[in-house]
C-alpha cells in the first residue's frame, strides 16, 4: 500500500513501503521478492482502473 499523501509512482515503477520510495519494476528481475514487485505484477492497464474503481 502506498503511503498516504505521496504522489503516485510513474509508469513502470511501484511503491516500496520497505524503502519508502517508488522503485523500478525492472529491478524485480534481479530481486523478485521485493515488496514492491507485487504491485508491478498486479497493476492492471489504466483504462480498467478508470472503468472499475
Amino acid at each position: 500500500e502506498q503511503a498516504p499523501g505521496t504522489a503516485p509512482c510513474s509508469r513502470g515503477s511501484s511503491w516500496s513501503a520497505d524503502l519508502d520510495k517508488c522503485m523500478d519494476c525492472a529491478s524485480c528481475r534481479a530481486r523478485p521478492h521485493s515488496d514492491f514487485c507485487l504491485g508491478c505484477a498486479a497493476a492492471p492497464p489504466a483504462p480498467f482502473r478508470l472503468l472499475w474503481p
Partner: antibody, heavy 119, light 111 residues
C-alpha cells in the same frame, strides 16, 4: 544525504596484500547490494566484485581477473564494505570505488581510493 | 562476457546543440519489457554519476535535457540542448548478467 567513503589505498609491492574499506551512511545499507569497481587509464571502468544481502546468504561474485585473489565482505552492523586484495600485480593499479545499488544500476558511488602496485 | 562498444570515442558539440552517444552490446540485454542498460556521467576528479537506468529512466535530479533510448543491442544517450556543465566522459553499463561491463567511454567537449 548518501555518503560512501573508501579508505585503505596506497602503494604496495607486487605480490603484496591490501585491505580496502568503505563506510556507508544515508541509506539502508543492509538492503543494498554492494560492489567494488576500479578505474585505470588502461582498462577504463572495470567491475571487480559484488556482495548481496543476508537473505541471499551474502552471495558474492567476482570478475574472472580477481577470482581467488580478492575477497569481498560486508558488516551490516557497521555499514561497512571490505575488499581484501592478495597477490597484487601491476594490472591491479587504479582507483577503487565502492558502489551501492538496489539492483542493476549503481546508484551510489564513493570518491574512490587509489591503489598503486609497484616496486 | 558482454562487450559494450561506445561511439564516438570523443565528440565536440556547440553550446545548445544536440549530443548523441551510441552504445552497442555484443548480445541483447533486453527482455520484452525492460532493457538492462544504464548511463553514467563522469567529470574529471569525480566518481561516475548515474544518469539513466533501464535504458530510458531518468535518475532523480538529472536534467530533462538528458534522455536515453534503445533496446536489444543498440542504445543511445542524447543531450539536448548541451550546456557547458555537460563537459564530461559518458559511460554505458549493462546488468544483464555477471560480469557487469562498462563501455570504453565517450568524452564530450562543448564548443
Amino acid at each position: 544525504e548518501v555518503k560512501l567513503e573508501e579508505s585503505g589505498g596506497g602503494l604496495v609491492q607486487p605480490g603484496g596484500s591490501m585491505k580496502l574499506s568503505c563506510v556507508a551512511s544515508g541509506f539502508t545499507f543492509s538492503s543494498y547490494w554492494m560492489s567494488w569497481v576500479r578505474q585505470s587509464p588502461e582498462k577504463g571502468l572495470e567491475w571487480v566484485a559484488e556482495i548481496r544481502l543476508k537473505s541471499d546468504n551474502y552471495a558474492t561474485h567476482y570478475a574472472e581477473s580477481v577470482k581467488g585473489k580478492f575477497t569481498i565482505s560486508r558488516d551490516d552492523s557497521k555499514s561497512r564494505l571490505y575488499l581484501q586484495m592478495n597477490s597484487l600485480r601491476a594490472e591491479d593499479t587504479g582507483i577503487y570505488y565502492c558502489t551501492g545499488y538496489y539492483a542493476d544500476a549503481m546508484d551510489y558511488w564513493g570518491q574512490g581510493t587509489s591503489v598503486t602496485v609497484s616496486s | 562476457d558482454i562487450v559494450l562498444t561506445q561511439s564516438p570515442a570523443s565528440l565536440a558539440v556547440s553550446l545548445g546543440q544536440r549530443a548523441t552517444i551510441s552504445c552497442r552490446a555484443s548480445q541483447s540485454v533486453s527482455t520484452s519489457s525492460y532493457s538492462y542498460m544504464h548511463w553514467y556521467q563522469q567529470k574529471p576528479g569525480q566518481p561516475p554519476k548515474l544518469l539513466i537506468k533501464y535504458a530510458s529512466n531518468l535518475e532523480s535530479g538529472v536534467p530533462a535535457r538528458f534522455s536515453g533510448s534503445g533496446s536489444g543491442t543498440d542504445f543511445t544517450l542524447n543531450i539536448h540542448p548541451v550546456e557547458e556543465e555537460d563537459t564530461a566522459t559518458y559511460y554505458c553499463q549493462h546488468s544483464w548478467e555477471i560480469p557487469y561491463t562498462f563501455g570504453g567511454g565517450t568524452k564530450l567537449e562543448i564548443k
